[in-house]
């Protein structure tokens, strides 16, 4: 396989990979080969190696299709889990409530000493980056409760004891904001590294796929909306009524301050809390129990619906008006999203023309505010922050490529939701 290096990418089977990115290769005629791990190295070379399986200490190990190595039955998901706890489906595998598992390829900016640990909690899959301890042995082994391999004899090491905080921000800040690319990846069949990183995400409209840094946090959440019960939400054994908000308490993570869940009739919707890049004060402080730093002695006045202060700030970050215009004719939709900025004083108009779900035309125009005032068909829809707009434009670049070659029904609507700033829980930015 010929490998080319372009900036910080590796090319493998006509697909680009970032430095440090890992995947299972798709090899004819086998399909996805889970027993081979490939990694994009610093010099742009793809290094693939066979997975070494640890010895299993049981009489009849079980082979699971999406895992390379056989496992002992006692490390498999419990079958007799209580019916009340919702299971999770991820990558074609069902996990029981409370179960921990490892995922590949979720974080583009994962460091070599980090792995992706996921847990199933009340039907939702939560994944975070775990920094693994330095290994002092030649043949580390896998343990059921952690994505990190450990030296024999350290088997009891739980991931809270690793030398790295699960929420440590990787040094590589290049992928700081991303409207997660995988939401728009083509289906895994025939795709190099074919793990569809969020399988079924298009049917789970609530999926949150933003790995934006929030006070040093990287969390990936997949929300599974398939299960419905009653008019309440149950999380971690607690019952919440419609409209109530809470920070999830996860076995693998503890209380996750930078994720806010809200009970929406019967389903919990969890969102990353975004911290501002800039604060109106010089020395914002980190306070225990809060996700983002706060300005001492300053409290933003809440306006109905969105938490802006009187200067148009949202959680310390300046906001800008977002306008929208949607025009439909003969099965063709022209959608325009416009952001008005003060510095420079201009309006950036993003124009999408979609016919039968296929993107026909996408372009961006920068016009003066004066010119924009001549356009009465634009309606103010929200205010957003520069960091949210950055996520929007990155996601837009990804889906503009993808939706020009295949049908996209909801992608743009989902992407526009990124611009809406949710009313933050009192005191939590």
């Amino acid at each position: 396989e010929q490998v080319k290096h372009s900036e910080t990418y590796c090319m493998f089977q006509d697909k680009k990979y970032r430095v440090g990115e890992r995947w299972h290769p798709y090899l004819e005629p086998y399909g996805l080969v889970y027993c081979v791990n490939c990694i994009c190295s610093e010099n742009g070379n793809v290094l693939c190696s066979r997975v070494r399986c640890p010895n299993v200490h049981c009489l009849s190990p079980v082979h699971i299709p999406h895992l390379c190595c056989p496992r002992c039955p006692d490390s498999l998901p419990p079958v007799n889990n209580k019916v009340t706890s919702k299971s999770c489906e991820y990558n074609g595998t069902t996990y029981q409530h409370g179960e921990l598992f490892v995922a590949e390829g979720l974080f583009q900016n994962r460091q070599p000493n980090q792995c992706t640990q996921c847990s199933c909690s009340e039907g939702n899959v939560y994944c975070g980056l775990k920094t693994c301890p330095k290994l002092t042995c030649a043949f580390p082994v896998s343990v059921p409760d952690s994505c990190c391999r450990v030296c024999r004899g350290d088997g009891e090491l739980s991931w809270e004891h690793s030398d790295g905080d699960i929420f440590r921000q990787p040094a590589n800040r290049e992928a700081r904001h991303s409207y997660h690319r995988s939401h728009y990846d083509p289906p895994p069949s025939r795709q190099a590294g074919g793990l569809s990183r969020f399988p079924g995400a298009r049917s789970h409209r609530g999926a949150l796929m933003d790995s934006q840094q929030a006070s040093g946090t990287i969390v990936q959440i997949v929300i599974n909306n398939k299960h419905k019960h009653g008019q309440v939400c149950v999380s971690n054994g607690k019952t919440y009524s419609h409209g109530e908000s809470w920070h999830p308490n996860l076995r693998a993570f503890g209380i996750v301050e930078c994720v806010l869940c809200t009970c929406n009739v019967t389903k919990q919707e969890c969102k990353k809390i975004h911290c501002p890049n800039r604060y109106p004060c010089k020395y914002p402080q980190k306070i225990d129990g809060k996700c983002c730093k706060v300005c001492p002695g300053k409290k933003a006045k809440e306006l109905p619906g969105q938490s802006f202060d009187n200067k148009g700030y949202f959680c310390g970050e300046e906001t800008m008006p977002v306008y929208e215009s949607v025009f439909m004719e003969d099965g063709e939709t022209t959608r325009k999203i416009a952001l008005e900025t003060e510095r420079p004083p201009q309006v950036e108009v993003h124009v999408w023309t979609i016919r039968k779900g296929i993107l026909q035309h996408f372009h961006i125009e920068k016009i003066s505010k004066r010119m924009f005032e001549e356009l009465p068909h634009f309606k103010l829809v929200t205010r957003t922050t520069l960091s949210q707009w950055k996520i929007f434009t990155e996601g837009e670049a990804q889906i503009s490529q993808m939706c020009s070659s295949r049908v996209c029904r909801t992608e743009l609507e989902d992407l526009v939701k990124v611009l809406y700033l949710e009313r933050s829980e009192k005191g939590h930015c």
């Epitope: 025009f327 022209t334 003066s368 004066r370 010119m371 356009l375």
Partner: antibody, heavy 122, light 107 residues
Framework: EVQLVESGGGLVQPKGSLKLSCVAS????????MHWVRQAPGKGLEWVAR??????????YYADSVKDRFTISRDDSQSMLYLQMNNLKTEDTAMYYC?????????????WGTGTTVTVSS | DIQMTQSPATLSASVGETVTITCRAS??????LAWYQQKQGKSPHLLVY???TLAEGVPSRFSGIGSGTQFSLKINSLQPEDFGSYYC?????????FGGGTNLEIK
Amino acid sequence: EVQLVESGGGLVQPKGSLKLSCVASGFTFKTYAMHWVRQAPGKGLEWVARIRSKSSNYATYYADSVKDRFTISRDDSQSMLYLQMNNLKTEDTAMYYCVRDGGYYVGYFDVWGTGTTVTVSS
Amino acid sequence: DIQMTQSPATLSASVGETVTITCRASENIYSYLAWYQQKQGKSPHLLVYNAKTLAEGVPSRFSGIGSGTQFSLKINSLQPEDFGSYYCQHHYDTPPTFGGGTNLEIK
């Protein structure tokens, strides 16, 4: 190849009428705002009129010098742009260019036609 | 309406020289300025928009400078095909207006 070709120019008497046409090819005509720009003999360029796309409600704008006398229109199905000129004056004598806007709204002109000459004289 | 004033009206230069044409707006138009070239008997064509962005296919010897009310078009190492008329135009609002033009002629 992106092209604009004007027609309909000619000699007309003051207070007379003339309709200029412009056929567009090589691009998705309906997505662009379109303009007419003119140039009197030996003089500079003067913007005449603009029509936006259907998604902008075909909004029209005119230079003060032609307001209430000229009408800009378009037929997206035929990729045609028109300029109906009524109550013509001698100062309307010029080369008329059909011009494409750089986008929906940007207001600079990235494609120009070859022009059609309008002469208003008795 | 915004008035655009171009100078000089005529400019004589030789092949290989560097020339600068200036354009002044009657009010702040930020960077909403375009430059066009028109050769004798031909249609104008776009050189620069947004004050400094070169249009597709325009040689790099052309460059646009300025913002606010003062703008310039600089042509490095003049080529024979560069002689003709040059116009600035604001695209800040409606109506878009043009400068009076600069005729660049061979010395």
